[in-house]
């Protein structure tokens, strides 16, 4: 059974009897503010191996492992997040440990452990075997480690059950609970998942399956699930819904919106079975299911009720899917985030018109603003203290406002206010004043010469490529051996370089401040030789594919008050040379006559280059003696020829703790007071941890239902 | 020490265009100051022309934005004034000056060119 | 434009006697960065300007301290403990909030 489209359980434990006969929870699951210590041995869900968006835990009591409500859990998509997360388990007093042990995939978001006082069995979870990225998981304020003495099935008696992982250069055994190892897959399935008996799933399962190589035997499926089946994409006549499984015409048209009683009903577009129209696209008439082109954006008008939304999480941004016109202010807090810039043009791209101010703040995640990539008009309806309608302040990383060669963006009303700004250059304020109409309105306090740009290569000179040379998969680029004012002051060279099928990129799509970036960077040596170019050659790239590349000079040099000066390149468009394309694919040859054979193929998945014409090669072929030699009637069958398989032990090496001891014999040092960097890392953490939980708790009280 | 060095002629006769150089030396024009221009007409006042930021961005008094052009050679770490259609009213001693990080005072100040408007 | 009044025109001074100029604006000098936008210059004659008093009452490097600046709003005032010999000249305020820049009429300093 299918359950959704999300559900809440709260205040009483026996609502849990809800989940008895869900197999996939479309939608979230709440459990949470359970007051009441229950005894919760009786509740059992094998069925639940799904849920397609989040898992949320909030102070339930009495719960002391998830392992034997949910021992089959497996998948946990995280189709739609809880403020970036695709498990929370917060407050939970009485949890000794996860206990998951089927949980095998976190499709999408990280997690977040917090606040769990007894919870052990953290450190012995390799959580980067569920999901793709752990940079952004957040487990802090739970039981210390030392005082759980986690130990793993078998570890006692000398006799480990579990694998090892590396996690943090430790080599360790990986389990759930005392009782239950952390399922891993042998290396020759790859990225496939595998069964308990670790045979390889089919590729398009996701989790586990209960038999090798067989699409209908998944328990939870990579792609898309139909009939049964799972499939990489929905057959004719069906759609993707909620983005795991494929519904009919009829299904989507029988939804009735969870959001809204009013609600138009479903919309079926581009092959999905949606709530509404996606962001360019309107319906064609107020009953019809289908969705048009608008010409020009789509007008959304959204409306903030508190005048002022606040965009400090890709959940908050979410809200503001397709809107083209903002009715209010937008504060900007975006502190950290896995690839924010993306979700963020995604979910804030369509923004046209801002009617209040924009004020954008502590923002150290952001590189750009290029995110709001459709901005043209603040209104400046509203303003805030001192007339500002666009204000700027501590964003440590941000970099570049937008592309201004290829932007217009008005400021109606009001002024602009830049501060505290390290990497922004002072020039580009001034161009965008120019843009934007606003010149002559700042006056000298609102754009801080000295605080905006002050760790910035500003003054940029300029590096010429000297030489490119392409073979299939190499470029060899040299270039002008940049020479700062003072030789010593110039450290090495970045190369950036990726694909790039169209020439209109820029130094900062896709980038963020917490590691996501398009492009590929190398560090590229001085030469010892100072009559010699500085070059790189750029291996393992695509045959005929076009690729951006542009050089950056790492200096020390700073001019007067502090500001850098730097070097780099233009974007330079290079593409590989054609080679050999890859194998015709399914190459069928049929026999029509005892004189003719007929030979059909499909083009080679990567060409290499322009196609021009295929070569077709036969000959004929003596019959085998083999195949009289060996009676196929016969119960023996033909040998398997075995192969080796390559795997290594490795020792474990066990290293003496040292004790540091300062000044001879004085006894073990005191711990160093924090740098201003750690206490102000400290702040920083504090404050996301209280934004955080006011979004937890703004998100769950609701008032109850009259 | 930053150094403010003026030189231009003296002497430009009417609806003529008065050319004015500034140089700075012990520093960087690309520092994160901005350079302005500023005149006294003899037994007057002072009277602020105009400003330049070493990527080019200007403001200009208004009274005399039609007239004014300033720009900045950065290669020669120098910044010049031009003001077109002069006549005996523009008459002054003219002075660079180096508005510190852009917050509206003059630390450094060149030493001034008296520049006279006469046939 | 931001206009800015200055008074007295002239100052006769005694050496060893405190002096005081002041200065009004026509409109706020006080930025919400809790910054006033007002400086002070003294000119002496044949010399080009020199800082005094900067951002309403921050003294310049190499000022002596028997200057000082207060005020703030559209209300200024420059002080000078005890006048010395060197101080004469001509006084000028000047806002630095918002371009067109703009000076005070002077206030000339003599020495009775």
């Known amino acids: 059974e299918i359950c959704g489209p999300g559900i809440d359980i709260r205040n009483d434990y026996q609502q849990l009897k809800r989940l008895e006969n869900c197999t996939v929870i479309e939608g979230y699951l709440h459990i949470l503010l359970i007051s009441k210590a229950e005894d919760y041995r009786s509740y059992r869900f094998p069925k639940l191996t799904v849920i397609t968006e989040y898992l949320l835990l909030f102070r339930v009591a009495g719960l002391e492992s998830l392992g034997d409500l949910f021992p089959n859990l497996t998948v946990i998509r995280g189709w739609k997040l809880f403020y970036n997360y695709a498990l929370v388990i917060f407050e939970m007093t009485n949890l000794k440990d996860i206990g998951l042990y089927n949980l095998r995939n976190i499709t999408r978001g990280a997690i977040r452990i917090e606040k769990n006082a007894d919870l052990c069995y953290l450190s012995t979870v390799d959580w980067s075997l569920i999901l793709d990225a752990v940079s952004n998981n957040y487990i802090v304020g739970n039981k210390p480690p030392k005082e759980c003495g986690d130990l793993c099935p078998g570890t006692m008696e000398e006799k480990p059950m579990c694998e090892k992982t590396t996690i943090n250069n430790e080599y360790n055994y990986r389990c759930w609970t005392t009782n239950r190892c952390q399922k891993m897959c042998p290396s020759t399935c790859g990225k496939r998942a595998c069964t308990e008996n670790n045979e390889c799933c089919h590729p398009e399962c996701l989790g586990s399956c209960s038999a090798p190589d067989n699409d209908t035997a998944c328990v939870a499926c990579r792609h898309y699930y139909y009939a049964g089946v799972c499939v990489p994409a929905c057959p004719p006549n069906t759609y993707r819904f909620e983005g795991w499984r494929c519904v009919d015409r009829d299904f989507c048209a029988n939804i009735l919106s969870a959001e809204s009683s009013d609600s138009e009903g479903f919309v079926i577009h581009d092959g999905e079975c949606m709530q509404e129209c996606p962001s360019g696209f309107i319906r064609n008439g107020s009953q019809s299911m289908y969705c048009i082109p608008c010409e020009g954006p789509c007008p959304k008008v959204c409306e903030e009720e508190k005048k002022t939304k606040t965009i400090d999480s890709v959940t908050s941004a979410q809200m503001l899917q397709g809107c083209t016109i903002f009715k209010g202010n937008l504060l900007i807090n975006i502190r950290r985030g896995n690839n924010i810039a993306s979700e963020l043009e995604n979910f804030m791209g369509l923004i046209e018109v801002v009617t209040g101010y924009v004020k954008i703040r502590h923002s150290h995640a952001l590189v750009s603003l290029s995110f709001l990539k459709n901005l043209r008009l603040i209104l400046g309806e509203e303003q805030l203290e001192g007339n500002y309608s666009f204000y700027v302040l501590d964003n440590q990383n941000l970099q570049q406002l937008w592309d201004w060669d290829h932007r217009n963006l008005t400021i109606k009303a009001g002024k602009m206010y830049f501060a505290f700004n390290p990497k922004l250059c002072v020039s580009e304020i001034y161009r965008m004043e120019e843009v934007t109409g606003t010149k002559g309105r700042q006056s000298k306090g609102d754009i801080n010469t000295r605080n905006n740009g002050e760790r910035a290569s500003c003054e940029s000179d300029v590096l010429h490529f000297t030489s490119t040379t392409t073979s299939k998969n190499r470029i060899i680029i040299t270039w002008h051996r940049y020479r700062p004012p003072d030789y010593r002051d110039l450290i090495s060279f970045t190369v950036y370089y990726k694909e790039a099928p169209f020439k209109n990129v820029t130094e900062y799509d896709g980038q963020d401040a917490c590691g996501s970036n398009s492009w590929n960077m190398v560090d590229v040596d001085l030469p010892p030789n100072k009559d010699v170019e500085p070059g790189i050659l750029l291996h393992g790239l695509k045959p005929w594919t076009q690729y951006a590349v542009y050089v950056k000079a790492v200096t020390l040099t700073m001019v007067e008050n502090d500001h850098i000066r730097g070097a780099k390149s233009e974007i330079l468009y290079i593409r590989t040379n054609a080679s050999v394309p890859s194998i015709p694919l399914d190459v069928l040859s049929a026999s029509n006559s005892s004189s003719q054979l007929i030979v059909k193929w499909n083009p080679p998945s990567l060409p290499n280059g322009n196609l021009s014409y295929y070569i077709v090669r036969w000959q004929r072929q003596p019959q085998d003696g083999y195949l009289y030699r060996h009676n196929y009637c016969s119960k023996d069958k033909i040998p398997i020829r075995k192969y080796a398989d390559g795997t290594i032990d490795i020792e474990e090496v066990t290293e003496n703790p040292k004790t540091e001891v300062c000044g001879g014999e004085k006894g073990p040092c005191c711990a160093c007071p924090k740098t201003e960097a750690e206490k102000q890392a400290e702040k920083e953490e504090a404050e996301y941890r209280k934004v955080f939980e006011n979004f937890l708790h703004n998100s769950i009280f609701v008032p109850r239902p009259e | 020490q930053v150094q403010l060095q003026q030189w231009g002629p003296g002497l430009v006769k009417p609806s003529g265009t008065l050319s004015l150089t500034c140089a700075v030396s012990g520093g960087s024009i690309s520092s994160s100051n901005w350079w302005s221009w500023v005149r006294q007409p003899p037994g007057k006042g002072l009277e602020w022309i105009g400003e330049?930021?070493?990527?080019?961005?200007?403001n200009y008094n208004p009274s005399l934005k039609s007239r004014v052009t300033i720009s900045v050679d950065k290669s020669k770490n120098q910044f010049s004034l031009k003001l077109s259609s002069v006549t005996a009213a523009d008459t002054a001693v003219y002075y660079c000056a180096r508005d510190s990080s852009g917050q509206g005072y003059f630390d450094y100040w060149g030493q001034g060119t008296l520049v006279t408007v006469s046939s | 434009d931001v206009v800015m009044t200055q008074s007295p025109l002239s100052l006769p001074v005694t050496p060893g006697e405190p002096a005081s100029i002041s200065c009004r604006s026509s409109?706020?000098?006080?930025?919400?960065?809790?910054?006033?936008?007002l400086d002070w210059y003294l000119q002496k004659p044949g010399q080009s300007p020199r800082l005094l008093i900067y951002l309403g009452f921050n003294r310049a490097s190499g000022v002596p301290d028997r200057f000082s600046g207060s005020g703030s709003g559209t209300d200024f005032t420059l002080k000078i403990s005890r006048v010395e010999a060197e101080d004469v000249g001509v006084y000028y305020c000047m806002q630095g909030l918002q371009t067109p820049l703009t000076f005070g009429g002077g206030t000339k300093v003599e020495i009775k």
């Open positions: 330049i930021y070493h990527s080019g961005s200007t």
């Open positions: 409109q706020s000098l006080l930025h919400t960065n809790g910054y006033n936008y």
